[in-house]
Amino acid sequence: QRFAQAQQQLPLESLGWDVAELQLNHTGPQQDPRLYWQGGPALGRSFLHGPELDKGQLRIHRDGIYMVHIQVTLAICSSTTASRHHPTTLAVGICSPASRSISLLRLSFHQGCTIASQRLTPLARGDTLCTNLTGTLLPSRNTDETFFGVQWVRP
Amino acid sequence: QRFAQAQQQLPLESLGWDVAELQLNHTGPQQDPRLYWQGGPALGRSFLHGPELDKGQLRIHRDGIYMVHIQVTLAICSSTTASRHHPTTLAVGICSPASRSISLLRLSFHQGCTIASQRLTPLARGDTLCTNLTGTLLPSRNTDETFFGVQWVRP
Amino acid sequence: QRFAQAQQQLPLESLGWDVAELQLNHTGPQQDPRLYWQGGPALGRSFLHGPELDKGQLRIHRDGIYMVHIQVTLAICSSTTASRHHPTTLAVGICSPASRSISLLRLSFHQGCTIASQRLTPLARGDTLCTNLTGTLLPSRNTDETFFGVQWVRP
């Protein structure tokens, strides 16, 4: 019985399987390009199992290789709006600790109103991920249009 | 010997690893925006290990957090076609049971001819996922251009 | 003690978890549409754990179902450049052995300057994946704009 329990706990506890899916809470003040995220069952279908939020930014709790994914949709947008307000760019990166600061993923909107991508990247305990939206257009807060998540893949 | 077998089976049987990758079978009749999917080794590189198809819609067999991904390419399309026929929108959601109905993922084509995205979401045994393509443009059935899949990630 | 070690090794050694994330090294000569990739800790955040590079192309070492993902950004690009140089297309496929040659994933740039997608597909030991960029535009070598990776998901 105890062995069976240990088995079931193993992947979640020992091996990680840290995972988070976040929804947009709000954008930053004027000079702050960061998006601020929120997550938890009370908010719908977002959640954090392992990683934590620190002032709206995602902080990693377990070393490993992660799949990072994001989709951002602009709120009031047509292809003409998007091209007129170009460049509007979304970048996901490690923003702290400063010694590990790096851009992981970058996309421009050009004539589109949604960007979506994903990548594998090594992350370390304590890394905080920031998502910077530069330009004058605002993101949609609809939970099926704008979301950001990570999934622990292996040590 | 028996213990070693149990070990190897554990992730697939006990822990899940349910996974499916589907190819487009057909579009619905006139007033039905749903795409109808098919999968299986006889059809090429599509497969279902755990989830099942119910009248062309994907039904989940195991509770857990899933990575859902989709790519849809329009069959006859240029950036001018796409903008002239705007809005063409793709939405992935839980369509049954009705009590759990929700849109999980939504993208518009704007001036593009392909949308592709992915997200993490909790799904429960019995949830049926529907993919609704609204607008007048038709999807490509090429298996490298249009596909839909889910991957169980953790309980 | 020995049992605990065996437990920790099981997913990585016995069950696979092969994973790779590559960055662009260079494009091919005139008539060769393939992108040539590189990976390893000395190069930044790219890595190979299981799969190998063979003359810049990714070779699979373990049978299984894989999540394949890619993002390619064009180097000097605006929506007008992209539409003027249309069609620019990215295809990911098995290019060897010849008997298993097939296109897995295909996207056109239309009026956009970045494509990004992912899919689940069965791959076998010895399969070599090629990424063909057709058209006259060149890809960006920025590691946050152009990358290609695979993740073993299950047997």
Partner: nanobody, 119 residues
Framework: EVQVVESGGGMVQAGGSLRLSCAAS????????MGWYRQAPGKQRELVAL???????NYAGSVEGRFTISRDNAKNTLYLQMNSMKPEDTAVYYC?????????????WGQGTQVSVSS
């Protein structure tokens, strides 16, 4: 097994009309995506018109408003009515049938019919 045979190609003056036909022999005709591709010399093959089993249609921007695709499920025939033709419509036109149901993905192509538009 499905056989697909095109007819109706030929030469026409700019501004003129032609009607292409495609006879499909085989089961479940009404369950096919069907369409017309064309390929001009030195160019890529292009899908110009598509029709579903229940009659929904899509057209390439270059032919929209000039070409009309239709099908007669009783006669197992697909048509492409081409009006206000232009020299750039010169190409080999191929009928295409794409199967839905059953065990597998089946695509069927005709041998093509030449259409030439002179100015």
């Amino acid at each position: 097994e499905v056989q697909v045979v095109e007819s109706g190609g030929g030469m026409v003056q700019a501004g003129g009309s032609l009607r292409l036909s495609c006879a499909a022999s085989g089961k479940r005709f009404s369950f096919y995506f069907m369409g017309w591709y064309r390929q001009a010399p030195g160019k890529q093959r292009e899908l110009v018109a598509l029709i579903t089993g229940d009659g929904r249609t899509n057209y390439a921007g270059s032919v929209e408003g000039r070409f009309t695709i239709s099908r007669d499920n009783a006669k197992n025939t697909l048509y492409l009515q081409m009006n206000s033709m232009k020299p750039e419509d010169t190409a080999v036109y191929y009928c295409y049938a794409d199967a839905f149901a059953g065990a597998g993905r089946d695509e069927y192509w005709g041998q093509g019919t030449q259409v030439s538009v002179s100015s």
